[in-house]
């Protein structure tokens, strides 16, 4: 997976968990086991 910033500690930590990357109007967000807070 890829995070928009390697400084995003949470993204880097969770990104291996079968995350599928999807585009939103604002930015790229992860959607995996659950979902990012809307």
């Amino acid at each position: 997976c890829s995070c928009s910033s390697l400084m995003d500690k949470e993204c880097v930590y969770f990104c291996h968990l079968d995350i599928i990357w999807v585009n939103t109007p604002e930015h790229v967000v992860p959607y995996g086991l659950g979902s990012p807070r809307s």
Epitope: E10, C11, F14, L17, L33, S35, R37
Partner: antibody, heavy 118, light 108 residues
Framework: EVQLVESGGGLVKPGGSLRLSCAAS????????MNWVRQAPGKGLEWVSS????????YYADSVKGRFTISRDNAKNSLYLQMNSLRAEDTAVYYC???????????WGQGTLVTVSS | EIVLTQSPGTLSLSPGERATLSCRAS???????LAWYQQKPGQAPRLLIY???SRATGIPDRFSGSGSGTDFSLTISRLEPEDFALYYC?????????FGGGTKVEIK
């Protein structure tokens, strides 16, 4: 000293709701990812849900997805689990656990018992 | 879902003996994502090992973890009376996070 104290468990009828709380102390709560793990009577451990430190990433086990909601209030050093549409198979001791940023849970509360029965 | 199979289900040993517990994954798990916990009756689990082989804070050096891929193990070099308990492995490498079924280490 790190402490996690769960509350809110009890007896509820099938289809009912409960809200569990976990009060954290002894560490900077807002810096840690948190989790709920449950254990049915006489059974093994089952991961329920995870929430990242800022609440940006929220994950659920398939068995609870759509029925349970995890949340946190960093200002109150508290973790929550809203449980709706409860089923008999949700009967368990529910533990909150701190994720230590090493892909494991280094501190656990003592648990709160949820019993779903008519 | 990664299924973790622990064996044996029960291990009957005497204090001072060596205990070797196995955790086999249904698919490969990076060693970074494998942990071991101890649980005693009526108590919450306690983290022993993370990253397959790193001891958690305060864990005695008689506990050691090893393994990679699909086969992991927890070794207790010399059993102390307080070590008789349930032991669980857990993987954090794939969704959902899963625990093994546990191994009970009992006094022979």
């Amino acid at each position: 000293e790190v402490q996690l104290v769960e509350s809110g468990g009890g007896l509820v009828k099938p289809g009912g709701s409960l809200r569990l709380s976990c009060a954290a102390s002894g560490f900077t709560f807002s810096s840690y990812n948190m989790n709920w793990v449950r254990q049915a009577p006489g059974k093994g451990l089952e991961w329920v849900s995870s929430i990242s430190s800022s609440s940006s990433y929220i994950y659920y086990a398939d068995s609870v997805k759509g029925r349970f909601t995890i949340s946190r209030d960093n200002a109150k050093n508290s973790l929550y689990l809203q449980m709706n549409s409860l089923r008999a198979e949700d009967t368990a001791v529910y533990y909150c656990a701190r994720d230590n940023w090493n892909y494991s849970f280094d501190y656990w509360g003592q648990g709160t018992l949820v019993t779903v029965s008519s | 879902e990664i299924v973790l199979t622990q064996s044996p289900g029960t291990l009957s040993l005497s204090p001072g003996e060596r205990a070797t517990l196995s955790c086999r994954a249904s698919q490969s798990v990076s060693s970074s994502y494998l942990a071991w916990y101890q649980q005693k009756p009526g108590q919450a689990p306690r983290l022993l090992i993370y990253g397959a082989s790193s001891r958690a804070t305060g864990i005695p050096d008689r506990f050691s973890g090893s393994g990679s891929g699909t086969d992991f193990s927890l070794t207790i070099s010399r059993l102390e009376p307080e070590d008789f308990a349930l032991y669980y492995c857990q993987q954090y490498g794939s969704s959902p996070l899963t625990f093994g079924g546990g191994t009970k280490v009992e006094i022979k």
